[in-house]
Amino acid sequence: MDQQAIYAELNLPTDSGPESSSPSSLPRDVCQGSPWHQFALKLSCAGIILLVLVVTGLSVSVTSLIQKSSIEKCSVDIQQSRNKTTERPGLLNCPIYWQQLREKCLLFSHTVNPWNNSLADCSTKESSLLLIRDKDELIHTQNLIRDKAILFWIGLNFSLSEKNWKWINGSFLNSNDLEIRGDAKENSCISISQTSVYSEYCSTEIRWICQKELTPVRNKVYPDS
């Protein structure tokens, strides 16, 4: 299945209606002229405005239905209130094939790639290489790795200019977080296994882990009509 199609369905717009011209944006000179022309034109203007409103209303309904359909199709866990309009946080489930680990969705690749290609692959999936906040998150992630002889790239590599391990979000590694086995040198990237954290040459072809943050979405709920 195409993962990107799934993300497209999950990235719902905050506003249910499509962008459309408001009546006030109609050209001003349309409704000017002789009294008879003015009457005819005003009638036409009223008709156009009415048509725009009807189309907008239909668009809102259709878009709302499409969104509802997408939400149901992707098993998004959003409980909708049926009697009043509310705004409250909701939590998206992870897309198919992704594993939930606390507030993240993780995707463990089945193929192998150098670090740069792995980074690019995660980007195409609207995600990033795994960022590990602390030892606790590392252990929980390692528990999902089924064999000791599998290495996975994460989003940490050696910055030659700063002579330090740098996460792909720009922050530097807190040395207490991960105990890295291997050298800190140029062209070194970090991989994790079931039991350890290793410095490997970035050109090495191993598997990788992408992450998507699970963040609350503000969810506008419309009453039944």
């Epitope: 150098p114 002889a149 086995r181 350890s196 290793y198 040459y201 050109s203």
Partner: antibody
Amino acid sequence: EVQLVESGGGLVQPGGSLRLSCAASGSTFSSYAMSWVRQAPGKGLEWVSTISGSGGSTYYADSVKGRFTISRDNSRNTLYLQMNSLRAEDTAVYYCARGGLIPSGFDYWGQGTLVTVSS
Amino acid sequence: DIQMTQSPSSLSASVGDRVTITCRASQSISSYLNWYQQKPGKAPKLLIYAASSLLSGVPSRFSGGGSGTDFTLTISSLQPEDFATYYCQQTYSTPLTFGQGTKVEIK
């Protein structure tokens, strides 16, 4: 073209030691996991050990764990297998091969070197 | 450990024959299966990886199939240079294990 050439095999007495080498050329050696696979005379293939590209992670078959040590020198493009406490059942042709980290297969092999453990 | 069982252990065939070798894993290994060809006195050679992907340079008469526990290697039209021993190998988990081999002989 990737080339792997093993050396260091020979006759050794039970309990003895031997060190095998595998010289690699034709690719970025440090970017690949490397492995040793053996084949007893007239028998099938048996995975022995794997080492990651940096040498940081190593893996062994239970039959050799604690007796064999895999290592590599990336500056010399060479893979090693230090074999201690050798037994008669270790007699085999030992191949070095590129790959071995899951899920990769062994895409290049050396010609093999024969290790005979006998008194 | 995952056991790999090949069948038959040996077979006799003629040039031009269609030959199929099967490999069964003792548990599901998804598509983490490779096939190797070995000729007497030579090192094994990787033919197929990930159950069905043909390695570059390997003749198209070789094909692989299957997933889970049951896999096949098929040679659509046996050539003189194909007489050899064939091994399957799982790369799903350590220890990496091989089948016992299937020897393809001339009839």
